[in-house]
């Protein structure tokens, strides 16, 4: 995409502290790589609301991201 | 409490130059996606430019490329689009938008601001 440059996390800022559970069609962990040294959380919103970032060190991303490894380990 | 609110906006030659801003109020920019969004009479909104405080990187549509500089100031909480070059096609209600957890992908999409300025009036004429 060409708003992209190597080296940039894909969130701007930290992220929000939830979304409404209802709203969320899917979740995705993007883990530190070259690109971003921090784990970023984010929402795929259903009905074709595009994406949102959850702030990592929130409680809901932590849920998220226990499930998301719980079910990939 | 968030509050957006813009200024300078007015009516100016084609060619002219005008400089708008959004004072931030309730927030910190470092922690939002600031966008300007236009929208003409009988168009939908469309996103102009965004600016990320945090560290420094500016989007644009197509359209403003090489005319319009968006930029901020932490210390005074508010961000400035200057306009070069106008021209009658740029006619239209500027906003100003605050956005948090805004993906760089989706920063010129108004589905991704929570919060939203009043508007600013720019009319180009020939």
């Known amino acids: 995409f060409p708003m992209f440059k190597r080296g940039r996390c894909l969130c701007i800022g930290p992220g929000v502290k939830a979304v409404k559970v209802a709203d969320i069609e899917k979740a995705s962990i993007m883990y530190p790589s070259n690109n971003c040294d921090k784990i970023e959380v984010i929402i795929t919103l259903k009905e074709n609301k595009g994406q949102r970032c959850l702030n990592p060190k929130s409680k809901q991303a932590r849920l998220i991201i226990k499930k998301v490894e719980r079910k990939n380990f | 409490e968030v509050q957006l609110v813009e200024s300078g906006g007015g009516l100016v030659q084609a060619g002219g130059s005008l400089r708008l801003s959004c004072a931030a109020s309730?927030?910190?920019?470092?922690?939002?996606?600031i966008g300007w969004f236009r929208q003409a009479p009988g168009k939908e909104r469309e996103g102009v430019s965004c600016i990320s405080s945090s560290d420094g990187s500016t989007y644009y549509a197509d359209s403003v490329k090489g005319r319009f500089t968006i930029s901020s100031d932490n210390a005074k909480n508010t961000v400035y689009l200057q306009m070069n070059s106008l021209k009658p096609e740029d006619t239209a209600v500027y906003y100003c938008?605050?956005?948090?957890?805004?993906?760089?992908?989706?920063?010129?999409?108004?589905?991704?601001?929570?919060?939203w300025g009043q508007g600013t009036q720019v009319t180009v004429s020939s």
């Open positions: 309730g927030f910190t920019l470092d922690d939002y996606a």
């Open positions: 938008a605050a956005g948090q957890g805004v993906l760089r992908l989706w920063v010129l999409s108004s589905s991704s601001y929570d919060y």
